[in-house]
């Protein structure tokens, strides 16, 4: 049994880091493998993660962490029974993938303005809470070419757009994702999408 693709890990900078790797053949990850992780610091404790299958030869493990600070460094040991398959380390602050925003809502009752709001996925005491910026994706269900991205570079989790920038009388979907420049994070996953019917009063043409 060998590791084909070494574990790579990302942290949500809150409580979970996710590590993925590939074995050289079909593997029952949860029965055959264990990922041990330990904070490199005084009197720390070794924890065991039981991986799950992620495709035939792929494994994924969700490492629980009580808190994360930028200096944290973890040792990682991948075991198959008594055999050490791989040894590495992981610094969560250098591999951050934020949590996805939630509760995306489209408010359509504001005089021909669409107000999109969503929730910051972090509690106020988390460092990332005040450092997230967002991308909002809006697309038409009828027209694949009608696909747009709005970058929200301010901290408020909301976006206002004129309803008239979209076509009237058709359905649209929106989703949102987050990233944090301070830790040069990757983008989060997209939030679940929300759907609405876009309609607004066309202004009378002036002749």
């Amino acid at each position: 049994m060998k590791v084909l693709q070494e574990p790579t890990c990302v942290s949500d900078y809150m409580s979970i880091s996710t590590c993925e790797w590939k074995m050289n053949g079909p593997t029952n990850c949860s029965t055959e493998l264990r990922l041990l992780y330990q904070l490199v610091f005084l009197l720390s404790e070794a924890h065991t993660c039981i991986p799950e299958n992620n495709g035939g030869a792929g494994c994924v493990c969700h490492l629980l962490m009580d808190d994360v600070v930028s200096a944290d460094n973890y040792t990682l040991d991948l075991w198959a029974g008594q055999q050490l398959l791989w040894k590495g380390s992981f610094k969560p602050s250098e591999h951050v993938k934020p949590r996805a925003p939630g509760n995306l809502t489209v408010h359509t009752n504001v005089s021909d303005t669409l107000l999109l709001t969503w929730s910051n996925p972090y509690p106020p005491d988390n460092y990332l809470y005040n450092h997230l910026t967002y991308a909002v994706n809006i697309w038409s269900e009828n027209d694949p070419a009608d696909f747009r991205i709005y970058n929200v570079t301010y901290l408020e989790p909301s976006l206002r757009i004129a309803a008239s920038t979209l076509k009237s009388g058709i359905s649209y979907r929106a989703r949102v994702r987050a990233w944090a420049q301070c830790y040069n994070t990757t983008w989060s996953e997209w939030s679940p999408s929300t759907k609405w019917h876009n309609s607004y009063r066309e202004p009378f043409e002036q002749h």
Partner: antibody, heavy 119, light 107 residues
Amino acid sequence: QVQLQQSGTELVKPGASVKMSCKASVNTFTGYNMHWIKQTPGQGLEWIGGLHPGNGDSSYNQKFKGRATLTADKSSNTAYMQLSSLTSEDSAVYYCALTTAGRAWFPYWGQGTLVTVSA
Amino acid sequence: DIQMTQTTSSLSASLGDRVTISCRASQDISNYLNWYQQKPDGTVKLLIYYTSRLHSGVPSRFSGSGSGTDYSLTISNLEQEDIATYFCQQGNTLPPTFGGGTKLEIK
């Protein structure tokens, strides 16, 4: 809310030993470290050492190594510190402090045990 | 051992004031700087850990900042219940060491 209850005031003679306790209101000691800190008006706060009750690992300040012994009873979530060969310099308030394993800050403190060393 | 120095041993301020308490380490401590409050009855509480992180349940008027060797604790709007002695502590290098404390009093 985690609470730490320390044993009461001790009056001991020079050369003797003292053993104090600290009971933690946690479900399990596993995942925590218990540290001990000395406070005197002259020297301020000094870290004596820390113990991982789950696996028995310990770390001591060189200044107290050999005289301080940290132990724990996992069944009762109680930690102990024994200090031997006492002198008047050991008269102080001793605090226990609980922290998540591997962390360098002390979120939960006991109320302190006053030790007076006097003939 | 790393020496932690709180140059101001006592400080007088009025209720509502913004108060800053400083702490200097004898070498770089990589943000492993924590602040504690000790009340006159001996009760000790963690306020700030890892330079600027507010411990749960601590009022938001407390904040911390700094880097390298120089750190500070700020109380933005002093209240009567903040009368206490404040200690800094480094956790970067064994043994963890504490500052001598800054006693905060009301004018």
